[in-house]
């Protein structure tokens, strides 16, 4: 069964910078990826970026750079302009779609005990999954 993993990491050099890494584990080619924060996309979450393998990417603040790392994984750099760090307790969700076969979504957040530069383990936590 296809699964999605999500990692959130704080940059060691800039404590106001975060990077979200997401990947798809399964067969098939990915046709669209949506990254949201504050919850699943369309369920209280706010879109941060949409990535298409051929048409490019769209991103919204505070997303700084969305890019493909491999054909089945992406990264999204975030810039926290506030004095406090709201990203630390925020849930980030990634939805991978393989049109028209289906779509899969998982969420993750920065582990409470994370030191800067350390990332969450790539444990898949599917919250919405196509049958």
């Amino acid at each position: 069964t296809p699964e999605v993993w999500v990692q959130v990491q704080m940059e060691a050099t800039e404590l106001s910078s975060f990077t979200v890494h997401c990947g798809f584990l399964g067969p098939g080619s990915i046709s669209l990826v949506t990254v949201s924060w504050g919850g699943p996309d369309g369920a209280g979450g706010t879109k941060l970026a949409v990535l298409h393998p051929e048409l490019g990417t769209r991103q919204w603040a505070p997303a700084r750079q969305a890019r493909w790392e491999t054909q089945s994984s992406i990264s999204l750099a975030l810039e926290d302009s506030g004095a406090s760090s709201p990203f630390a307790n925020t849930t980030f969700c990634c939805k991978f779609a393989s049109f028209p076969e289906g779509s899969w979504e998982s969420c993750g957040s920065l582990p409470p005990s994370s030191d800067p530069g350390l990332s969450a383990p790539p444990t898949p936590v599917p919250i919405l999954r196509a049958d």
Epitope: V50, F99, P100, E101, G102, S103, W104, L128, R129, A130
Partner: antibody, heavy 120, light 106 residues
Framework: EVQLVESGGGLVKPGGSLKLSCAAS????????MSWVRQTPAMRLESVAT????????YYPDTVKGRFTVSRDNAKNTLYLQMSSLRSEDTAIYYC?????????????WGQGTSVTVSS | QIVLTQSPAIMSASPGEKVTMTCSAS?????MFWYQQKPGSSPRLLIY???NLASGVPVRFSGSGSGTSYSLTISRLEAEDAATYYC?????????FGAGTKLDLK
């Protein structure tokens, strides 16, 4: 202006065959996934075939699998639906529709439809 | 396949009223769309990805929902809104539609 124009519908006997065409214009046809959707006399909408950009991958629901074949000619900007072993329940208006990637593959443009009647 | 159940099947409302119709899925869906169809015309995209308005759609239309429960709301009904509204998903193949909600104006 985006346009999708279906043709090829008509009256056919049960067990017969028919080939529908959808002529596309106003956009780069080869960049878009396309679907055939039918509307039954009861006004139900049913997806019967989907083909992605390159035309290699095709998808069908169980109701038409093995009987319908979707194909595309990107050079001619045309989508096709070959229907065989037709049954009375295939009677419907057949629409071709375009899927827009950045609209999460919503069907953002539809043709005017072509009517298919399967009856003896 | 995912079955979408729309309710009510038929509804009647007066111009200026707020109306809401629902779409319930047999299992959780990630992408929901709404289409409007008037008699003698092809379906027209209204809402994509649950809550985004398609180009040219009046702001009186809005969509919401998650998981298995979705809705389409028209804040102030106008005469031109008389139509049948369909929900559609593609979280898993085949793409499926609801049976529609027919909206009549009083």
């Amino acid at each position: 202006e985006v346009q999708l124009v279906e043709s090829g519908g008509g009256l056919v006997k049960p067990g017969g065959s028919l080939k529908l065409s959808c002529a596309a214009s106003g956009f780069t046809f080869s960049n878009f996934a396309m679907s055939w959707v039918r509307q039954t006399p009861a006004m139900r909408l049913e997806s019967v075939a989907t083909i992605v950009n390159g035309g290699i991958n095709t998808y069908y629901p169980d109701t038409v699998k093995g009987r319908f074949t979707v194909s595309r000619d990107n050079a001619k900007n045309t989508l096709y639906l070959q229907m065989s072993s037709l049954r009375s329940e295939d009677t419907a208006i057949y629409y071709c529709a375009r899927h827009d990637d950045f609209l999460y593959y919503a069907m953002d443009y539809w043709g005017q439809g072509t009517s298919v009647t399967v009856s003896s | 396949q995912i079955v979408l159940t729309q309710s009510p099947a038929i509804m009647s409302a007066s111009p200026g009223e707020k109306v809401t119709m629902t779409c319930s899925a047999s299992s959780s869906v990630n992408y929901m769309f709404w289409y409007q169809q008037k008699p003698g015309s092809s379906p027209r995209l209204l809402i994509y990805d649950t809550s985004n308005l398609a180009s040219g759609v009046p702001v009186r239309f809005s969509g919401s929902g998650s998981g298995t429960s979705y809705s389409l709301t028209i804040s102030r009904l106008e005469a031109e809104d008389a139509a049948t509204y369909y929900c559609q998903q593609w979280t898993s193949y085949p793409l499926t539609f609801g049976a529609g909600t027919k909206l009549d104006l009083k």
